[in-house]
């Protein structure tokens, strides 16, 4: 056969679907690899061919589109399962070709089982809700294209294992779930089960997402440097270890990059000819506010090092702040035999 542009196995698209539920999978060629869509390809005389490799097998096989009740079918650039079975798991390939052109890509499809509380190995999308905010909504994801707009499905929402009915702060509104108030107690998994009829059969779509309640943008502040501060003086003798922590609190901000760094005499530590190490630790509050600590360490400090300026800097989407540490050379305590004796005029 003639050469085919093989995009390999697209592991970026780790498609997971539930057993015994409908699944519609678009050929990734048109979404990620080619600059034209299926309609253009079809009108240019290109044909889309599907085949697969079963789990733990090397043999590529054609997909059987002659199963009872059209359990597996193809419609334009979509491969349909009505419904899936556990042994549909494998690598699927879609190939676009005619006599002069060929392009193909493979992707893994995993059919997973769920228990009665919707627990499964499925990787769940995370939806962040703000604490101390107005009404917020989550929407039942990835249900477009399964049924026409003329079909009115029934949607049932669950919080973990509990059917959401007459909840004090959460109201199901069709495909949306409205949170009148988002409490930290609302953290967890929410599932919508969409039930719809098709050709005399009833299908269920189960979609679970994780809700994480985070700090409100209304309460967000620029970074706050807790240490160094004006109350602590780092007084050292030459030869001792100098340890200065820079501890910074960052309000949660969606998609904000939080940064902490030290400068020594206005330069980055790497650009100063001293043996300095910096260790960072990060902790998060229940609402994903962040505390970063960077400890600047000089194992054996010199009198020159004790004259330098050590400044902690922090930056987030809310602003940039800096604070200098107060570093001093410790005045050695006088030794009686020499210093005091001299002071008393002894010779």
């Amino acid at each position: 056969s003639e050469r085919c542009d093989d995009w390999g196995l697209d592991t970026m698209r780790q498609i997971q679907v539930f057993e015994d539920e409908p699944a519609r999978i678009k050929c990734p060629l048109f979404e990620h690899f080619l600059k034209f869509n299926y309609s253009t390809a079809h009108s240019a005389g290109l044909t889309l061919i599907w085949y697969w490799t079963r789990q733990d097998r090397d043999l590529e096989e054609p997909i059987n589109f002659r199963l009872p009740e059209n359990r597996i079918s193809k419609e334009k650039d979509v491969l349909w399962f009505r419904p899936t079975l556990l042994n549909d798991t494998g690598n699927y390939t879609c190939m676009l070709r005619n006599t002069t052109y060929c392009s193909k890509v493979a992707f893994p499809l995993e059919v997973v089982q769920k228990d009665s509380c919707f627990n499964s190995p499925m990787k769940l999308p995370v939806h962040k809700l703000y604490i101390e905010y107005g009404i917020q909504r989550i929407t039942c994801p990835n249900v477009d294209g399964y049924f026409p707009s003329s079909v009115k499905p029934t949607i049932t929402w669950y919080m973990g294992c509990y059917k959401i009915q007459n909840f004090n702060n959460v109201i199901p509104e069709g495909m949306n779930l409205s949170f009148l108030i988002a409490f930290i107690s609302n953290n967890g998994n929410y599932t919508c089960v969409v039930t719809y009829p098709e050709n005399g059969r009833t299908f269920h779509l189960t979609r679970t997402l994780t809700v994480k309640v985070v700090g409100s943008p209304k309460n967000a502040v620029p970074p706050v440097i807790h240490s160094p501060n004006d109350h602590v003086v780092y007084e050292k003798e030459p030869g001792e270890e100098l340890l200065i922590p820079c501890t910074v609190y960052f309000s949660f901000l969606m998609d904000s990059r939080n940064e902490v760094w030290w400068t020594i005499d206005g330069k980055k530590p790497d650009d100063i000819p001293i043996d300095v190490t910096i260790n960072e630790s990060i902790s998060h509050s229940r609402t994903e506010d962040e505390t970063r600590t960077q400890i600047l360490s000089i194992k054996k400090v010199t009198s020159e090092d004790l004259k330098r300026s050590y400044v902690c800097h922090a930056r987030s989407a809310k602003g940039e702040v800096a604070k200098a540490a107060t570093v001093k050379q410790k005045v050695p305590a006088p030794r009686y035999t020499v210093e005091l004796a001299c002071g008393f005029g002894a010779t």
Epitope: E132, G134, N168, I181, S185
Partner: antibody
């Protein structure tokens, strides 16, 4: 520390009206909601109504729906419960309580105001 | 409405005793339960929220446990100031409902 102080209670005839106030001192009420809870003499606690802080959404117990109205005046940092068509069974100490914004809990309570409905 | 049933209704105990109060919900409320203490003529005071979290400033002799429909409030060593009435409160389902109360009195 925010404190809640109720006022407006008293003796009223059946069918009459009263307006209870719940004023916050020491800061804004804050929280996720403010609730009214009542306690008939010698009885337990019964939830009456709530108003959400961020959306002004209101909810009522079935026993008071259509008769009681909860509202607030942000400028005065005060919550109100307008009680109409009062009945003998509405006799109780009325407490306002703040619903926390972090967890479902009523973390601050007022000292209560007594409403007596009697002819 | 969800029924919250507390037991016992009255409990006689002595200072130093370990006291346990049970609260049962008529349907599952996850961990959306709070416990309050009320003394005569006073407003209720929050002790426990989220079924097992101790409210700030509340002595550590108070603890809560449970999830779903069965919950307990435990006072590990009863103190003179603990003689009061205790209420459980479910906050998951509309409307909020309270237990009928458990009066802890001196034996």
């Amino acid at each position: 520390e925010v404190q809640l102080v109720e006022s407006g209670g008293g003796l009223v005839q059946p069918g009459g009206s009263l307006r209870l106030s719940c004023a916050a001192s020491g800061g804004t009420i804050g929280g996720s909601a403010v609730h009214w809870v009542r306690q008939a003499p010698g009885k337990g606690l019964v939830w009456v109504s709530r108003i959400l802080t961020y959306s002004s959404t209101t909810q009522y117990a079935e026993s008071v729906k259509g008769r009681f109205t909860i509202s607030r005046d942000n400028a005065k940092n005060t919550l109100y419960l307008q009680m109409n068509s009062l009945r003998a069974e509405d006799t109780a100490v009325y407490y306002c309580a703040r619903g926390s914004s972090e967890y479902p809990k009523f973390d601050i309570w007022g000292q209560g105001t007594l409403v007596t409905v009697s002819s | 409405d969800i029924q919250m049933t507390q037991s016992p209704s009255t409990l006689s105990a002595s200072v130093g005793d370990r006291v346990t109060i049970t609260c049962r919900a008529s349907q599952s409320i996850s961990s959306w339960l709070a416990w309050y203490q009320q003394k005569p003529g006073k407003a209720p005071k929050l002790l426990i929220y989220d079924a097992s979290s101790l409210e700030s400033g509340v002595p550590s002799r108070f603890s809560g446990s449970g999830s779903g429909t069965e919950f307990t409030l435990t006072i590990s060593s009863l103190q003179p100031e603990d003689f009061a009435t205790y209420y459980c409160h479910q906050l998951l389902i509309y409307p909020h409902t309270f237990g009928q109360g458990t009066k802890v009195e001196i034996k």
